[in-house]
């Protein structure tokens, strides 16, 4: 707490300028007016006060706003805003995209911290729901963004926001939050043609069922392995070796490396050599010929 | 390659002035605060002052007007002016970039440059 | 005024040792202080900033805590190339300073 010190004669400030940056820590408590900092927060930014002087200017701003800042004041913090704490930022009601855009904007270039992630949970909650324009905002700044947010609250995003997502958006997705998005991606992009579709949806395949797979191994897709690679391995597993031949077209010729990883791996035993000798690859471990293969989970349905 | 280069270091005489610069390469000096430190032989870091990037200077409580941190956005290069020198300002003299618009940490550093203040 | 001290001021460990160095601020500065490295006949080198965040390219046994007016340096497994000494300075202000760095602990290999 700074110390309540009368203001010296002529020091009085008429206006939040660049001289403010010679005022003592006491000398800018007792002579920069609240409600006058208040109106001029726009010019605090170009102003390049210490962290100690941005310190007696949050102070005076608390004051003024016990309850919490206006979004007028708010959207112009600029440098300011890194002096506040996740409590500060519980207190705001952020309802303006360009607020947060400036806000995202001084921490550009550095990791999502307390404090971002606690303005974007109340920026986020207060819109209701994921709209494109905000996730194409975030993902901006924080590609990641996406991929940090649990399966319930991808659940929020509409189908339409999907057209915002690029592929490095979903680099750090787990399967559990792809199942979540692939059936919103799906529908966002049905009306689109089988390359181009493919194209969209290939990103979010490692949340596709078996059934969608099979289908796309009939539109001549060429999947890569990397993406081969992300699919579900119980998507994978009811595939054919032909299906998968089409699926990935001269791919296929990557399935040898990957051969001792999931989901190649538990794939390759499901198959009958015999077919996986059609490929020509050399790949072992499937069902020797001659052995007959029950489906015991078939069986447990019929029982 | 991003550095600093101090120069314009040498023997004077006491009461003599000398001005050093800091010329960079690499990076915009006009968008960081930049500072100068000194360093007396077989002493600790000294302080001198500091440059914002509107301009504004600020000395350590020592310096009492005998120094000036002057910059020249177009030659990318800082400068300090020394007057009145003492034996006593006897060191090595390095520039150093500040991460911060204002005043901050020093992440990078000139190679340094020596003034002996001798008669 | 805000001064900085630095303790020990001098120390000899051997390698692996665990060693800490300590900072002291005659008044808040909240985490805004930073610690360097230097060898002898060399620019000083940012280790530490924001009181704990590890500078690029500095290696992991280096850390930094505390926050107000105590920090502390600690290197976890000392190694041959460590003998340098190390300064504390804070980055808060820039009026009412004699000196933003500590006085400077230098430390040596036994």
């Known amino acids: 707490e700074v110390e309540k010190t009368a203001c010296p004669s002529g020091k009085k400030a008429r206006e939040i300028d660049e001289s403010l940056i010679f005022y003592k820590k006491w000398e800018l408590e007792a002579c920069v007016d609240a409600a006058l900092l208040a109106t001029q927060m726009d010019r605090v930014n170009a102003i390049p006060f210490t962290y100690e002087q941005l310190d007696v200017l949050k102070h005076k701003l608390d004051e003024l706003y016990p309850q919490g800042y206006p979004e007028s004041v708010i959207q112009h913090l600029g440098y300011l805003f890194l002096k506040m704490s996740p409590e500060d930022i519980r207190k705001w009601n952020v309802t303006s995209l360009e607020t947060l855009k400036a806000l995202l904007e001084v921490n550009k270039g550095h990791e999502m911290s307390p404090q971002v992630a606690t303005l974007i949970d109340r920026f986020v909650k207060g819109r209701g729901q994921l709209d494109k324009d905000t996730l194409d905002t975030l993902t901006a700044f924080y590609p990641g963004y996406l991929c940090s947010l649990s399966p319930e609250e991808l659940s929020s995003v509409p189908p339409s926001s999907i057209w915002a997502v690029r592929p490095q958006d979903l680099d750090t997705c787990d399967p559990r939050q792809l199942d979540v998005l692939y059936p919103k991606a799906r529908l966002a992009f049905q009306n689109m043609n089988g390359s181009e579709y493919f194209v969209k949806i290939q990103s979010f395949l490692g949340g596709a069922p078996t059934e969608d797979l099979k289908a796309l191994s009939q539109q001549n897709v060429s999947m890569d392995l990397a993406t081969f690679m992300k699919l579900r391995t119980d998507a994978v597993l009811p595939l054919t070796v032909a299906e998968v031949q089409k699926l990935l077209g001269p791919h296929v010729e990557g399935l040898k490396a990957e051969e001792r990883h999931r989901p190649v791996r538990d794939w390759i035993l499901r198959q009958r050599q015999d077919d996986l000798d059609t490929l020509g690859l050399g790949l072992q471990g499937g069902i020797p010929n001659g052995y007959l293969v029950l489906d015991l989970s078939m069986q447990e349905a019929l029982s | 390659q991003v550095q600093l280069v101090e120069s314009g270091g040498g023997v004077v005489q006491p009461g003599r002035s000398l001005r050093l610069s800091c010329a960079a390469s690499?990076?915009?000096?006009?968008?960081?605060?930049m500072s100068w430190v000194r360093q007396a032989p077989g002493k600790g870091l000294e302080w001198i002052g500091v440059?914002?990037?509107?301009?504004?200077?600020f000395y350590a409580d020592w310096v009492k007007g005998r120094f000036t941190i002057s910059r020249d956005n177009s030659k990318n290069t800082l400068y300090l002016q020394m007057s009145s020198l003492r034996a006593e300002d006897t060191a090595v003299y390095y520039c150093?970039?500040?991460?911060?618009?204002?005043?901050?940490?020093?992440?990078?550093w000139g190679q340094g440059t020596l003034v002996t203040v001798s008669s | 005024d805000y001064q900085m001290t630095q303790s020990p001021s001098s120390l000899s460990a051997s390698v692996g040792d665990r060693v800490t160095i300590t900072c002291q601020a005659s008044?808040?500065?909240?985490?805004?202080l930073a610690w360097y490295q230097q060898k002898p006949g060399k620019a000083p080198k940012l280790l530490i900033y924001?009181?704990?965040d590890l500078a690029s390219g500095v290696p992991s046994r280096f850390s930094g805590s505390g926050s107000g007016t105590d920090f502390t340096l600690t290197i976890s497994s000392l190694q041959c190339e460590d003998a340098a000494t190390y300064y504390c300075?804070?980055?808060?202000?820039?009026?009412?300073?004699?000196?933003?760095f500590g006085g400077g602990t230098k430390v040596e290999i036994k």
């Open positions: 150093a970039r500040v991460d911060s618009r204002a005043w901050g940490p020093f992440n990078l």
């Open positions: 690499g990076i915009d000096l006009s968008s960081y605060a």
């Open positions: 440059i914002d990037i509107s301009g504004n200077r």
């Open positions: 008044q808040s500065i909240f985490s805004y």
């Open positions: 924001d009181a704990s």
């Open positions: 300075q804070q980055g808060y202000t820039r009026s009412d300073v004699d000196n933003a």
